[in-house]
């Protein structure tokens, strides 16, 4: 607790002080006072530099004195033998004695009192910037007229802050300009313009004279401009050292003028104005700016249009252009949007074809579709090459965005039929010789696959079973073989409207229009053992002549068995219709004259006993295409016959091509279109 006075005595005083003692006293008087310390008695062992015994007086880090020996007063009216005056309110006194004393020393007696200090004169650093007023225990500062005392209660300055300039144009000068500016002042000016305008400051060199920098280059008085996180300055010296035109890129500017106690000059004067905030003419690749201008400023709007093949992707939506506005902060709106190459995406897969995984799916990339050859070909042309177009679609030169269609190749067997192992009336065949051959198990019959969804057969095969089970791809009709082959499920049976339905089909004598179509539920996958036969063309090239050869195949009756286990086939010539009429019906169900012969029928056979028979019905009479020798077309369908091993009658398919096409078109699925 600070005291105004006090007494300090060495140990045992006035007796001799003991050896090996170290004692200290911390003196503290109230703040605003100094300390007057005086000794009235001093009797301490004398040594050089008071090394043995001593009394030490310390103020802060400074040793004010170190005493030893004997002292007596020089003034008979005063008991003081030694005194110290310090302008601080704290003092430390330390007494030390060593291990021995040659004589008996009595030590010291000292007293301290608090004394007033004159803060205005007693210190090197003047506490007040202008006027200093001392009083007992303290001081206060005061200012000349028109100055005010700052919050620190020491510095005076002029009241030059708080001005806010909002006009788009204006002039600001230092206080008293062009007379000397006040010392020890901090002047702050604020320019606050409407958003979207930047403050532009202009100065003339001659309008600036501020106390120059010190030898280290630090401005003693300074002018600083602060715009957001950007600072211009500090500036000082004779003549403005900075740019005469300062574009702040901000609508808010703080001007700070700081002066010290010395060296007042005339100061400075500046002009400012608000410029609409400029936005940079950015280089946005793959795009065009509309309108094109040398400079864009606040509130300007441009339309940025992507070049062909480029698009703006925002979220999941692609657009070809976007608008951008020069904003109040000097930045363009939508600046994140970029014109990127159009991405056509992973190309769609196609049925019975493939597309190689593209290296790139971006604008300009090229892909190629191919069909699963040799079983499928590209029906709608175009070569299968597509490029990624500017609209984001894969486009073909011929088809545009329409995908290629892989359709089955018709009439081409994987292996040609050769009559190698002769069997009476025909040969063993492999399904690869007749990949269009369809097996019907109830009734036991045949049919011809004409495309993925359709089987052509005789009307009499399906008239009694409108849900036939069919199989493709197997040479043998043994159960274990059929279990491994492809079973076809019918969706609908279409019998030719000209086919007469009878109460008792067994007694039929009229086989005119013996043709039917079976629509399948699912498309058939083509391959070496399953592939369609072509339909005849409508031109006269497809009119059969007597002697023209055709191939028949099936699992019908043979000389040995009612039903063949493995596919049999024969090559037969076309014969005149009369040849069929002349053959006596084997097991007639009516008079021979009752049997109907029409131009819708083809007569064939008669050679070496080769003929179709019961169980072959509905199978194709395949003839080489006159316009493409590599292909076969279904010239006829096994229909009926007077006697197995003679001549047989076949439905003339050419006469039904229009009905076939119309039926298929009217009953196609969207997938097939």
């Amino acid at each position: 607790e600070p005291t105004m006075y006090g007494e300090i005595l060495s140990p045992n005083y006035p007796q001799a002080y003991p050896s090996e003692v170290e004692k200290s006293w911390d003196i503290e008087v109230p703040e605003g006072y100094g300390i007057h310390l005086y000794f009235t008695h001093l009797d301490i062992e004398l040594s050089e530099n008071c090394a043995y015994d001593s009394v030490q007086i310390i103020s802060g880090d400074t040793e004010e004195g170190r005493l030893c020996g004997q002292r007596s007063s020089n003034n008979p009216h005063s008991p003081i033998v030694e005194e110290f005056q310090v302008p601080y309110n704290k003092l430390q006194v330390i007494f030390k004695s060593d291990f021995s004393n040659e004589e008996r020393f009595t030590g010291f007696a000292a007293y301290y009192v608090a004394t007033d200090i004159n803060e205005c004169t007693d210190f090197v650093d003047v506490p007040c910037s202008h006027f200093c007023n001392n009083f007992i225990g303290g001081y206060f500062c005061s200012c000349p007229p028109e100055y005010f005392l700052h919050d620190d209660m020491k510095n005076c300055g002029v009241n030059c802050s708080g001005d806010v300039f909002t006009a788009l144009i204006g002039e600001i000068a230092s206080p008293n300009y062009p007379k000397p500016y006040p010392e020890n002042s901090r002047c702050e000016y604020q320019i606050r313009l409407e958003k979207g305008f930047q403050v532009v400051v202009t100065l003339r060199r001659e309008d600036f004279d501020v106390e120059a920098a010190d030898s280290a280059g630090n401005c003693l008085d300074s002018l600083v401009f602060v715009a957001g996180d950007r600072q211009f300055g500090p500036y000082c010296g004779h003549g403005f050292p900075g740019p005469l035109n300062i574009e702040t890129k901000s609508n808010a500017l703080d001007i700070i003028f700081q002066t010290d106690l010395t060296g007042q000059k005339k100061g400075w004067k500046l002009r400012y104005h608000g410029d609409p905030m400029p936005c940079p003419k950015e280089d946005t690749p793959n795009s065009v700016w509309e309108p094109a201008k040398a400079k864009y400023v606040f509130r300007d709007v441009v339309q940025i249009t992507c070049l062909d093949g480029f698009e703006v992707v925002e979220g999941r939506v692609g657009a070809t252009s976007f608008y951008s506005t020069c904003q109040s902060n000097g930045k363009w709106s939508n600046s994140k949007l970029k014109c990127q190459p159009v991405d056509c995406g992973i190309p769609e897969s196609i049925e019975n074809g493939k597309v190689e995984d593209p290296e790139s799916t971006l604008f300009g990339s090229v892909i190629r579709y191919t069909c699963e050859e040799p079983y499928y070909y590209m029906e709608n042309g175009g070569g299968g090459e597509y490029h990624c177009a500017g609209n984001g679609s894969w486009v073909n030169e011929v088809l545009g965005p329409e995908l290629p269609k892989c359709v089955p190749v018709c009439g081409v067997p994987r292996e040609p039929f050769e009559e190698k192992q002769r069997i009476i009336g025909g040969s063993d065949a492999d399904i690869k010789n007749f990949p269009w051959q369809v097996f019907f198990d109830n009734p036991w019959a045949g049919g011809a696959l004409i495309n993925e969804y359709w089987v052509l057969t005789a009307a009499h095969v399906v008239e009694g079973n409108r849900e036939p089970t069919m199989y493709v791809g197997s040479t043998s009709v043994q159960t274990s073989r059929l279990a491994k082959s492809k079973m076809l499920t019918p969706e609908h049976v279409f019998i030719h409207p000209g086919w007469k339905l009878l109460e008792v089909p067994e007694g039929r004598t009229n086989f005119d229009n013996d043709i039917a179509l079976v629509r399948l539920k699912d498309p058939v996958k083509m391959g070496p053992t399953v592939s369609p036969i072509c339909l005849p063309g409508t031109s006269s090239d497809y009119n059969l002549m007597d002697g023209d050869l055709g191939l028949i195949s099936g699992w019908g009756r043979t000389e040995k068995r009612d039903r063949a286990v493995r596919l049999k086939a024969a090559r037969l010539p076309v014969a005149p219709l009369r040849k069929c009429k002349e053959v006596k019906v084997e097991k007639p169900t009516a008079d021979a004259e009752a049997y109907v012969f029409t131009p819708n029928m083809i007569c064939a056979g008669g050679e070496k006993g080769m003929d179709s028979c019961k169980g072959d019905s509905g199978g194709a009479f395949a003839v080489q295409d006159p316009n493409d020798k590599t292909k076969f077309y279904a010239a006829g369908l096994v229909s009926w016959g007077p006697q197995c091993g003679t001549y047989g009658l076949y439905t003339r398919v050419k006469n039904y091509v229009d009905w076939i096409m119309k039926t298929m078109q009217e009953n196609s699925t969207p997938r097939e279109d």
Partner: antibody
């Protein structure tokens, strides 16, 4: 109609082999697929295997793999089934059966051959 | 190999009853399933093939249904001649395995 005539009953000792024959008449063996089925007394039917003429390979039930051999002599239209390393549980009636067509599994059955394995 | 599980193993019924026998395949066999009837000392007789097709000469009281893995044989009205053992057989895979059989006996 195909007829299948099998060889007569056999009595064999454990560890021995038995060869059962099956003669086809009314058709040729080349046109047929022959299967073999057995039935132990009071037990169920067990399919043993078949010769697949299309693939030219014999397919055996897992249970008999390594012990059974099925062969055919097309010149005499006779099929054979040989079972080796016989054990008492092989005592059964062994049938040869022709495979049917168009979804019918078995067409014609032989009269059966009783093989008795006893020490 | 595909396993065939037939149930029940024994079934007691009276003449005129409707009888159902179930056969379950361990994996799909499409419709490649047959049903046989066997009487003691005789070779099995085919009743149903391709799951639901009735073999010629078999009375219409026998019917089959199902596809994939679940199949049933139904005798709509049991006759005295129908007391026998019935077997299912799959013939989809190379191994044409039989079920273990269901004996239909007089109640």
């Amino acid at each position: 109609q195909v007829q299948l005539v099998q060889s007569g009953a056999e009595v064999k000792k454990p560890g021995a082999s038995v060869k059962v024959s099956c003669k086809v008449s009314g058709d040729t063996l080349t046109e047929l697929s022959m299967h073999w089925v057995r039935q132990a007394p009071g037990k169920g039917l067990e399919w043993m295997g078949t010769f697949d003429p299309e693939e030219g390979e014999t397919i055996y039930a897992q249970k008999f793999q390594g012990r059974v051999t099925m062969t055919e002599d097309t010149s005499t239209d006779t099929a054979y089934m040989e079972l080796s390393y016989l054990r008492s549980e092989d005592t059964a009636v062994y049938y040869c059966v022709t495979e049917g067509l168009a979804g019918i599994p078995f067409d014609s059955w032989g009269q059966g051959t009783l093989v008795t394995v006893s020490s | 190999d595909i396993q065939m599980t037939q149930s029940p193993s024994t079934l007691s019924a009276s003449v005129g009853d409707r009888v159902t026998i179930t056969c379950r395949a361990s994996q799909s066999i499409s419709s490649w399933l047959a049903w046989y009837q066997q009487k003691p000392g005789k070779a099995p007789k085919l009743l149903i093939y391709k799951a639901s097709s009735l073999e010629s000469g078999v009375p219409s009281r026998f019917s089959g249904s199902g596809s994939g893995t679940e199949f049933t044989l139904t005798i709509s009205s049991l006759q005295p001649d129908d007391f026998a053992t019935y077997y299912c057989q799959q013939y989809n895979s190379p191994s044409w395995l039989f079920g273990q059989g269901t004996k239909v006996e007089i109640k």
